[in-house]
Structures are given as structure tokens and as C-alpha cells.
């Protein structure tokens, strides 16, 4: 029997490589049974997670799961970093794994390691 607790299914150790200037949607998969919980996004700053107020968010419903989406329109260089979603459910705070955005600023892309360099220097992948 599946649990009726709220579950936040951001993938553990997930990463997104995105370009500054592009639109991007960061999804928080949410499983719930009856009432949809109140979900928020925050951005990690050291050990604290700063709540993202006044940011465009929306819900998308799919079969068996819903998504609470944080919209980046467009992505800015300082959007680089780690994000987490959290839900209030029966006076409990449920926190997701964090997910990391690696933002490439197209203006300085030439200074960044190429795909070939990444392949020949695999330790660059373990940031």
C-alpha cells in the first residue's frame, strides 16, 4: 500500500546545464493523495536555503504526479547554484533533495572548458 504522505521527488544529485538568456523551467515533482500541499522553492546559500519570493511559479498535472515549476524567464548568470523545494503537510515541513543549475554565460562561454577538454579531464565533471 503506497504511503499517503507528501513526497517531493527531485532527483538526488541532479544537475542541469543551462544557458543564460534562455527560458528554463525547474520542476519539483510532487506526490500527494487528497489536498495539494503548499510548496515553495528556495535557493541554497551555504547551509541556509533562502525562500524565493516574487518568482513566477506554476503547477502542471500529470497522471499520478504533479509538478511545481519555478520559471526562469530568462536564465540569468546569478541563477547558478543549488535549489530545493519544500512542502507543508499536516504541519510537517518536507524538503526535497537539492538540484544544481550550472549556468553558462554565453558572453564568457569561450573561457569555459570545451566538451573535448571535459572528456580528456574527467575530474572536471566532479564539481
Amino acid at each position: 500500500k503506497e504511503s499517503c504522505d507528501v513526497q517531493l521527488y527531485i532527483k538526488r544529485q541532479s544537475e542541469h546545464s543551462i544557458l543564460a538568456g534562455d527560458p528554463f523551467e525547474l520542476e519539483c515533482p510532487v506526490k500527494y493523495c487528497a489536498n495539494r500541499p503548499h510548496v515553495t522553492w528556495c535557493k541554497l546559500n551555504g547551509t541556509t536555503c533562502v525562500k524565493l519570493e516574487d518568482r513566477q511559479t506554476s503547477w502542471k498535472e500529470e497522471k499520478n504526479i504533479s509538478f511545481f515549476i519555478l520559471h526562469f524567464e530568462p536564465v540569468l548568470p546569478n541563477d547558478n547554484g543549488s535549489y530545493r523545494c519544500s512542502a507543508n503537510f499536516q504541519s510537517n515541513l518536507i524538503e526535497s533533495h537539492s538540484t544544481t543549475l550550472y549556468v553558462t554565460d554565453v558572453k564568457s562561454a569561450s573561457e569555459r572548458p570545451s566538451k573535448d577538454e571535459m572528456a580528456s579531464r574527467p575530474w572536471l565533471l566532479y564539481r
Epitope: 513526497q7 521527488y9 527531485i10 532527483k11 538526488r12 544529485q13 541532479s14 544537475e15 542541469h16 546545464s17 515533482p29 504526479i65 533533495h97 566532479y126
Partner: antibody, heavy 119, light 112 residues
Framework: EVQLQQSGADLVKPGASVKLSCTAS????????AHWVKQRPEQGLEWIGR????????KYDPKFQGKATMTADTASNAAFLQLSSLTSEDTAVYYC????????????WGQGTSLTVSS | EVVMTQTPLTLSVTIGQSASISCKSS???????????LNWFLQRPGQSPKRLMH???KLDSGVPDRFTGSGSGTDFTLKISGVEAEDLGVYYC?????????FGGGTKLETK
């Protein structure tokens, strides 16, 4: 029911490349990670790497970097492992493994694909 | 990379007897999220591996409660209280805290 169906056994010549497939049913690959695990005859298990089918992001064990390339296609709910410049060292069973919602806990295993590299 | 060392290599038991397998990691497997990503798998002859235990001590669905997992940091143990014939095979520990993820070398559980 969650199932991972892997492509059939393959016999290939040294120096060639091969692409193994893994098709998921009972869940959406987009919401999971797909891992690949190698097992040489009478040997233990080796983690090759994992792919996030939602965005193509990959992580490899450095010893498989350049040998293995993982890809995924969310439209067909499938993950793929390409192995290049094959040698007898690549003779093994390759397992496709999926996580429950990207938990990184290796929840569901395919039946394995036996690859033999021989001239 | 994190090295996972399993002992013993082979464990010969009588059916009904208890068995214990040790797994040691070269560094602590406690993740920053407070969880320890240590799993145990059983591979029966001719079959795919099957997960028995995740996050050190959480028993997987359908796995009998004669299996118990314990440990923390770098030292982990899988205990089987009263081995049954269906328990025979090769047991692997695995860490998913650090990239690259790594398996232990395996412990073969066989009958005397």
C-alpha cells in the same frame, strides 16, 4: 508493474562498437535515473555510470570515460549504452538499472545483456 | 574513489545457521543530507542482482525479516538469522554517497 527489458545477447568483433538498449515499462524514465552496471564472467559488479533521461546529464566512473557513452530517449522510454573500440575485456553482462524517482538507490534491474567480444 | 571491502570472500554455512557479512568503506558514507547510501544486493546463480536492503537497514519489499542491516560511517554488517536455501548466492554491498558509485567485491554464501 515496473520492468526493464534489455536487448538480446550480442557477439561482436574486436575493434567494433555496440549499442545496448533498455526499455522501461510501468514508469516514466524521465522521472528516474538510468544506471549501467558491468559484470565480467565470474567477477563482481562495476558501476559504469548513470544518465538523467530528462536532460541527458551523465556521470561516469572515470575508468569507463571514453569507452562507454550513455544516452536516453524519453519518447521511447529507453536508455542506451554504446561501447566503442571493443576488446575481450568488454566481454561481460551489462545490466540496466533504474531508480525510484531518482533516489540513486538502484531499485529496479533489467535481465542483463550478454556481450561477447571475439574474432 | 571509495573502496568497499567485503569479508569474508566465501562463507560456508549449514542451513538454519546464522551468517554475517562485513563491508567496510574507505571513507564515511554519511551524506550531507543525513542519510547513508549503503545498499546490500543478492545475486543468485544465473540471475540479476536483487536489492535486499537500502539506506543501511531498510528492508526491501518482499525480503524476509531474517535479514538485518546495521552499521554507520565506514563499517556495515548484513546478518542472516537462520539461512535458508534460497539465500545462497553472492552478496554485494554498494555505496551511492560519492561519485563514482562503487560495489564491494562480493561474498559468496554457500552450504557446507
Amino acid at each position: 508493474e515496473v520492468q526493464l527489458q534489455q536487448s538480446g545477447a550480442d557477439l561482436v568483433k574486436p575493434g567494433a562498437s555496440v549499442k545496448l538498449s533498455c526499455t522501461a515499462s510501468g514508469f516514466n524514465f524521465k522521472h528516474t535515473y538510468a544506471h549501467w552496471v558491468k559484470q565480467r564472467p565470474e567477477q563482481g559488479l562495476e558501476w559504469i555510470g548513470r544518465i538523467d533521461p530528462a536532460n541527458g546529464n551523465t556521470k561516469y566512473d572515470p575508468k569507463f570515460q571514453g569507452k562507454a557513452t550513455m544516452t536516453a530517449d524519453t519518447a521511447s522510454n529507453a536508455a542506451f549504452l554504446q561501447l566503442s573500440s571493443l576488446t575481450s575485456e568488454d566481454t561481460a553482462v551489462y545490466y540496466c538499472v533504474a531508480d525510484h524517482y531518482g533516489s540513486s538507490l538502484l531499485d529496479y534491474w533489467g535481465q542483463g545483456t550478454s556481450l561477447t567480444v571475439s574474432s | 574513489e571509495v573502496v568497499m571491502t567485503q569479508t569474508p570472500l566465501t562463507l560456508s554455512v549449514t542451513i538454519g545457521q546464522s551468517a554475517s557479512i562485513s563491508c567496510k568503506s574507505s571513507q564515511s558514507l554519511l551524506d550531507s543530507d543525513g542519510k547513508t547510501y549503503l545498499n546490500w544486493f543478492l545475486q543468485r546463480p544465473g540471475q540479476s542482482p536483487k536489492r535486499l536492503m537500502h539506506l543501511v537497514s531498510k528492508l526491501d519489499s518482499g525480503v524476509p525479516d531474517r535479514f538485518t542491516g546495521s552499521g554507520s560511517g565506514t563499517d556495515f554488517t548484513l546478518k542472516i538469522s537462520g539461512v535458508e536455501a534460497e539465500d545462497l548466492g553472492v552478496y554485494y554491498c554498494w555505496q551511492g554517497t560519492y561519485f563514482p558509485y562503487t560495489f564491494g567485491g562480493g561474498t559468496k554464501l554457500e552450504t557446507k
